[in-house]
């Protein structure tokens, strides 16, 4: 058993049918010694008397808010949550496996640049009685500070007969050095509590591996005289790291016909312009990627040919 926060405790339970459970001793936070009784949640049934209460925690029915009283007055509370292990594996029931980039991916994180700021998100089908708390650091043995905000509900989606809820959090490395080579990964830890169930989820990554630039901005077409060709130009996104001479991007320019089946013409360039043939009813799209490190491509920025 360990303390999650004041008066909230997590009992780690290795569960299997007929498991003996965990013996937990609760102590009433009071100088009083006599006439103390214990109850669980809203029930008035007296579970025991005395300054301490010993319970055997075998299942969620044994978890909840234990309260000690004297003469009708509440003396203190202890909320017991369960962290369940089955077959040697901690439960991961609260969050959905996003299965990308691999199975058992519960947290996904992205950074728009090298400033040390990043966003993580996760999915759940649970709509109520749910709280999250996020901590982060660079490295784990001698951790350097990363400050995370509060997790917020960022999207709701309907998936078949089910609703899916996306939560996200923004974090900022306290002393980020954008140009430095990373040697220690960022660690992100999410505590999730649903009703009386506690679970924790972790992710470890280098900022360079989670970079996903914003799409190029100010995408424009300039027709070339007496030609079907156009000059496409764009700019680095505002959110990308500066100077651009050091934090350089490479770009992919794509000409896509109205039909998805039509052949796509693609050009790769390090410049912020390219010359392409603009077909009728086609659109031109440009996306960006770090020039020197193969992290994610940005989403496409698009304009119609017409």
């Amino acid at each position: 058993i360990w303390e999650l926060k004041k008066d909230v405790y997590v009992v780690e339970l290795d569960w299997y049918p007929d498991a003996p459970g965990e013996m937990v001793v609760l102590t009433c936070d009071t100088p009083e010694e006599d006439g103390i009784t214990w109850t669980l949640d809203q029930s008035s049934e007296v579970l025991g008397s005395g300054k301490t209460l010993t319970i055997q925690v075998k299942e969620f029915g044994d978890a909840g808010q234990y309260t000690c009283h004297k003469g009708g007055e509440v003396l203190s509370h202890s909320l017991l949550l369960l962290h369940k292990k089955e077959d040697g594996i901690w439960s991961t029931d609260i969050l959905k496996d996003q299965k990308e980039p691999k199975n058992k991916t519960f947290l996904r994180c992205e950074a728009k640049n090298y400033s040390g700021r990043f966003t993580c998100w996760w999915l759940t089908t649970i709509s109520t009685d749910l709280t999250f708390s996020v901590k982060s650091s660079r490295g784990s043995s001698d951790p350097q500070g990363v400050t995370c905000g509060a997790a917020t509900l960022s999207a709701e989606r309907v998936r078949g007969d089910n609703k899916e809820y996306e939560y996200s959090v923004e974090c900022q490395e306290d002393s980020a050095c954008p140009a430095a080579e990373e040697s220690l990964p960022i660690e992100v830890m999410v505590d999730a509590v649903h009703k009386l169930k506690y679970e924790n989820y972790t992710s470890s990554f280098f900022i360079r591996d989670i970079i996903k630039p914003d799409p190029p901005k100010n995408l424009q077409l300039k027709p070339l005289k007496n030609s079907r060709q156009v000059e496409v130009s764009w700019e680095y996104p505002d959110t990308w790291s500066t100077p651009h001479s050091y934090f350089s991007l490479t770009f992919c320019v794509q000409v896509q016909g109205k039909s998805k089946r039509e052949k796509k013409d693609r050009v790769f360039t390090d410049k912020t312009s390219a010359t392409v043939i603009c077909r009728k009813n086609a659109s031109i799209s440009v996306r960006a990627q770090d020039r020197y490190y193969s992290s994610s491509w940005s989403e496409w920025a698009s304009v119609p040919c017409s």
Epitope: W15, P17, F60, G61, D93, T125, N162, K163, H194, L196
Partner: nanobody, 123 residues
């Protein structure tokens, strides 16, 4: 919302078997832990059995261990309770319940309930 409808109850002789079914509709059935409870006249609702959302883990009340088997078919959105070697003291209304906390024998840890199906065991 999850809607639960029990079926399969009836009158049987002691020592016989019965299979209860609980059909779920509404939100994704496979996200929920499922349980069976029962209530005899003049008594509190009593835990019978529970099954995890994956169906890989089951939990039983001591009074039914070895006689009752809970199972589920997530493709059919159905949970079953196979009851054998029935005794007169198994007579009760049997309720199906869905929740997110497994294992739990406490009724208020379940969020959704069916209307119940009567099982009568005569001696």
């Amino acid at each position: 919302e999850v809607q639960l409808v029990e079926s399969g109850g009836g009158v049987v002789q002691a020592g016989e078997s019965l299979r209860l079914s609980c059909a779920a509709s509404g939100r994704s059935f496979s996200d929920y832990e499922m349980g069976w409870f029962r209530q005899a006249p003049g008594t509190e609702r009593e835990f019978v059995a529970a099954i995890s959302w994956r169906g890989s883990s089951t939990y039983y009340a001591d009074s039914v261990k070895g006689r009752f088997t809970i199972s589920r078919d997530n493709a059919k959105n159905t949970v079953y309770l196979q009851m054998s070697s029935l005794k007169p003291e198994d007579t009760a209304v049997y309720y199906c319940a869905a929740g997110r906390l497994y294992p739990s024998s406490r009724s208020r840890d379940y969020d959704y309930w069916g209307q119940g199906t009567q099982v009568t065991v005569s001696s």
